[in-house]
Interface confidence: low
């Protein structure tokens, strides 16, 4: 069961604004009550929904861990959108952690790539212009970070 | 007082079909979300389907998703439950019980005695 | 690994206080949940005791007593269901719940069998 399939019970603010479900369903930036019979809007920063929904509550917005930058602040819609800082990228094979781009390219490569929130640098041979991705050690340092597409929010 | 009185459960082949039904009294039935909770012999509980007052919003578990239909008729007071292609895992006694969602609880509130469904060659 | 964790078995004498446990998984919060308990005795369907979010905010099923409470450990990320003045009717099944979507009322947790000591 994943956190979205079990949903907590969330206390309306009197201040949340309130209107009725469409078809059992609440829309986006809101969640319907106990009693089904009103949707109450999230609370702004504090949580979200992204469709039409029939949650108890808005689920929480993410907070980016130590070694993230937010790029994205959360709204009542969409969910905080966490990105690695600058020298660390996030792997596919693990979204969960920012790893250290490497410093530079191993002796007769050359960088073609700089390293970017969502990619190591990448380096391909001199002469035969092949990738090389494996851990090298480092012989030289050129690490930058240029703005794109964030990896997907962590939650 | 409130009474819910469950039927059509018994011994069905793998892969068979059974209708259970759900006779409720001493409240007003179409004001209220309804589910079918099942419990294997010897084992917990297992939320199966639920429904809301009207009828207009169905949910199910994925172990029954696409082989069991929940449906209700309020001018009958009734509830139901279509199981198709029928497992020797879906053995079990099934609940019928009352979602007490006029209420703030939003609880399982009332229950029926259950009625076993046997699902074996 | 369940979402919800109750030990299987616990045991204490007549007229004492128990409390039982429901451990929700690390990924979830229970400080933001209801927690729901319900009691089954042996060949009868499961009764509604009670339901706890907060101390200004539960609800007690229909005809249960008082000696019946909840509460929560949110640092723990626990649920609990206090017994007082035990009886031998209170040996029962007891199962946590969590509420879930509007409709899809609840998840349970596995039970705990509680058995009075005379």
């Known amino acids: 069961i994943t956190r979205q399939s079990l949903d907590p019970q969330r206390r309306a603010a009197p201040q949340q604004k309130r209107s009725s479900p469409t078809e059992g369903l609440c829309p986006p930036g809101h969640h319907i009550s106990e009693d089904s019979r009103e949707c109450i809007s999230c609370k702004y920063g504090q949580d979200y929904s992204t469709h039409w929904n029939d949650f108890l509550f808005c689920l929480r917005c993410t907070k980016c861990d130590s070694g993230e930058v937010e790029v994205n602040s959360c709204t009542t819609t969409r969910n905080t959108v966490c990105q690695c800082e600058e020298g660390t990228f996030r792997e596919e094979d693990s979204p969960e952690i920012c790893r250290k781009c490497r410093t530079g390219c191993p002796r007769g490569m050359v960088k073609v790539k700089d390293c970017t929130p969502w990619s190591d640098i990448e380096c391909v041979h001199k002469e035969s212009g092949t990738k090389h991705t494996g851990e090298v050690p480092a012989v030289e340092k050129t690490v930058t970070t240029s703005p794109g597409t964030p990896a997907s929010p962590c939650s | 007082e409130v009474q819910l009185v469950e039927s059509g459960g018994g011994l069905v082949k793998p892969g068979g079909s059974l209708r259970l039904s759900c006779a409720a009294s001493?409240?007003?039935?179409?004001?209220?979300?309804m589910h079918w909770v099942r419990q294997a012999p010897g084992k917990g509980l297992e939320w199966v389907a639920g429904?809301?007052?009207?009828?207009?919003?169905?949910y199910y578990a994925d172990s029954v998703k696409g082989r069991f239909t929940i449906s209700r008729d309020n001018a009958k007071n009734s509830l139901y439950l279509q199981m198709n292609s029928l497992r020797a895992e879906d053995t079990a006694v099934y609940y019928c019980?009352?979602?007490?969602?006029?209420?703030?609880?939003?609880?399982?509130?009332?229950w029926g005695q259950g009625t076993l469904v046997t699902v074996s060659s | 690994q369940p979402v919800l964790h109750q030990p299987p078995a616990m045991s204490s004498a007549l007229g004492t206080t128990i409390r039982l446990t429901c451990t929700l998984r690390n990924d979830h919060d229970i400080g933001v949940y209801s927690v729901y308990w319900y009691q089954q005795r042996p060949g009868h369907p499961p009764r509604f005791l009670l339901r706890y979010f907060s101390q200004s905010d539960k609800s007690q099923g229909p005809q249960v007593p008082p000696r019946f409470s909840g509460s929560k450990d949110v640092a723990r990320n626990r649920g609990y269901l206090s017994i007082s003045e035990l009886q031998p009717e209170d040996e029962a099944m007891y199962y946590c719940a969590m509420g879930a979507r509007s409709s899809v009322t609840h998840v349970f947790g596995s039970g705990t069998q509680l058995t009075v000591l005379s």
């Open positions: 001493g409240f007003t039935f179409s004001t209220y979300g």
């Open positions: 019980a009352r979602d007490s969602s006029t209420t703030r609880t939003r609880a399982l509130d009332y």
């Open positions: 429904i809301n007052y009207s009828g207009n919003n169905k």
